[in-house]
Interface confidence: medium
């Protein structure tokens, strides 16, 4: 059987789960007693077309309700487990009162008020986040939706819509809550080396240590085959066979400008004359391609103290 829930002293309207697109009449029963539920509106619980209305709902209304669709050649029976809960005393809304989570992104920033289509409601719908009324202009209530401009992770949380159902000249409150989570929309791009500059020459001192950092960015999110590495004379450092020159493992991952970047550091423990004649390539690669920045070393000119 399908489940529906509501809050005490609020309106609750439910549909027959067997209904489909049927236009045949629907009868409702208390399933434990088989007692028929009337269609007269003067009753607090009554049937209207395929809908069962609790105006308002009480905790003792909880139970299993049966609906029967009578068609000329077949009777279809559906069962609905209705639970009416007391209003939570605090702002923490329990899971059993939550409707499905909405996953938003910078492109999808719309929250729909759950079940509202079942009710005879009039705008505006009031919206609350974690029980606080939303008053910032970024939040726009339109019809049964809440639109959020410039969505960020700070907008995640529980959103409650509150509206009024009108029946027989009486207004009833309805509230419904659902979670909103923000999914980062990742993107992958051709790598960009941010440092060192293209065809850069770096000054070093013979006999002294030197280190060159290479950083590249790849987009945002998960990156396939993304790496930053060094080559010396077109040979990867590990195969170059010079113990003085090492590539720093455990590449530093950072995020700049909301982009995912990797850094690899080439360390020379003591620079020799021979190192000045070598070509050092910083390579950044991923699924989309590879980019190379070549760096050369030159001897630092001694400062003239004359």
């Amino acid at each position: 059987s399908k489940s529906s829930w509501g809050l005490e002293n609020e309106a609750l309207i439910v549909r027959c789960p067997q209904r489909g697109r049927s236009t045949y009449p629907v009868e409702w029963y208390y399933s434990d007693t088989n007692e028929s539920i009337p269609t007269q509106k003067r009753n607090r619980i009554f049937v209207s077309r395929d809908r069962l209305k609790f105006l308002p709902a009480r905790v003792e209304d909880s139970g299993i309700y049966a609906c029967v669709i009578r068609s000329p050649n077949l009777n279809k029976t559906g069962y609905l487990n209705v639970t009416i809960h007391k209003k939570p005393p605090s702002c923490n809304i329990p899971d059993y009162l939550m409707y499905s989570t909405v996953r938003g992104s910078d492109k999808n920033f719309k929250i729909t008020c759950p079940t509202i289509d079942l009710y005879n409601w009039t705008a505006p719908v009031q919206w609350f986040k974690n029980c606080k009324a939303l008053q910032e202009p970024r939040f726009r209530a339109h019809r049964s939706y809440l639109f959020i401009d410039n969505v960020t992770h700070d907008d995640e949380g529980d959103y409650t819509c509150q509206f009024t159902h009108a029946e027989n000249g009486t207004n009833y409150i309805v509230t419904a809550t659902r979670s909103f989570t923000v999914e980062e929309k990742g993107f992958s791009m051709f790598p960009v080396i941010t440092n060192p500059p293209y065809n850069h020459t770096m000054e070093v001192e013979i006999g002294k240590p030197a280190s060159i950092a290479c950083s590249a960015c790849f987009g945002k999110g998960s990156h396939f085959l993304a790496d930053v590495l060094w080559q010396i004379n077109k040979t990867v450092v590990g195969n170059f066979g010079e113990a003085r020159i090492q590539e720093e493992e455990g590449r530093n991952e950072s995020s700049s400008n909301d982009m995912d970047c990797l850094t690899s550091v080439l360390r020379i423990t003591g620079v020799t004359e021979k190192d000045l004649s070598l070509e050092y390539d910083c390579l950044a690669l991923n699924l989309h391609g590879m980019i190379r920045h070549t760096i050369r070393l030159r001897r630092k000119q001694p400062i003239d103290h004359r």
């Epitope: 396939f224 085959l225 790496d227 990867v236 590990g238 390579l283 690669l285 699924l287 989309h288 391609g289």
Partner: antibody
Framework: QVQLVQSGAEVKKPGSSVKVSCKAS????????ISWVRQAPGQGLEWMGT????????DYAQKFQGRVTITADESTSTAYMELSSLRSEDTAVYYC????????????????WGRGTLVTVSS | EIVMTQSPATLSVSPGERATLSCRAS???????LAWYQQKPGQAPRLLIY???TRATGIPARFSGSGSGTEFTLTISSLQSEDFAVYYC?????????FGQGTKVEIK
């Protein structure tokens, strides 16, 4: 004529590991990327991961992350795929497949396949 | 991940007839990133088409590929006995690279 020659069939116990090899003969191994794709009996193809031997960089499909290791030995033109914590649902034919490099970068379709290695996981 | 859906699951065709196989992606992919493979029982797959419409080396002209966005088609203009096999589409637009579940082309 370039060929990808794979190691022979294996029978493994649940919880153990298997290491399958794929040797490239004829051609420049370092200019390929090698991927591993598996096919369970009567099922479709499932990509597991890829290595670029020239750079020694490998990456994996999320489903296999932490359980699969792909390596390559440029000196012998051989790629390896090791799958650990084997379970019965890992019973499949494991294929190595080549992506060739064009002037710009690798073409990530598979233009050459090994004949496959049947790995049977059974207690 | 991008889900590739092939239809029909099985296609019964007489030799000499035309066969049209369909492949649908769950989201739009650039046509440059779709490949088709042929697989015969007990054999490895063989690349037929890449870039949605370019025939791989040695593939006969009766095989042609077309489509863009989410809808792609492999056409075999006149089926030969050696063409009866399972055909897979694959997207390599974004990882994980994914294959369709295959279409079996059988003799009618």
């Amino acid at each position: 004529q370039v060929q990808l020659v794979q190691s022979g069939a294996e029978v493994k116990k649940p919880g153990s590991s298997v290491k399958v090899s794929c040797k490239a003969s004829g051609g420049t191994f370092s200019s390929y990327a090698i991927s591993w794709v598996r096919q369970a009996p009567g099922q479709g193809l499932e990509w597991m991961g890829t290595i670029i031997p020239m750079f020694g960089i490998a990456d994996y499909a999320q489903k296999f992350q932490g359980r699969v290791t792909i390596t390559a030995d440029e000196s012998t033109s051989t790629a390896y795929m090791e799958l650990s914590s084997l379970r019965s649902e890992d019973t499949a034919v494991y294929y190595c497949a080549r992506s060739s490099r064009s002037s710009s970068w690798y073409n990530w379709y598979f233009d050459l396949w090994g004949r496959g290695t049947l790995v049977t996981v059974s207690s | 991940e991008i889900v590739m859906t092939q239809s029909p699951a099985t296609l019964s065709v007489s030799p000499g007839e035309r066969a049209t196989l369909s492949c649908r992606a769950s989201q739009s992919i650039s046509s440059s990133y779709l490949a088709w493979y042929q697989q015969k029982p007990g054999q490895a797959p063989r690349l037929l088409i890449y870039g949605a419409s370019t025939r791989a080396t040695g593939i006969p002209a009766r095989f042609s590929g077309s489509g863009s966005g989410t809808e792609f088609t492999l056409t075999i203009s006149s089926l030969q006995s050696e063409d009866f096999a399972v055909y897979y589409c694959q997207q390599y637009y974004t990882t994980p690279w994914t294959f369709g579940q295959g279409t079996k082309v059988e003799i009618k």
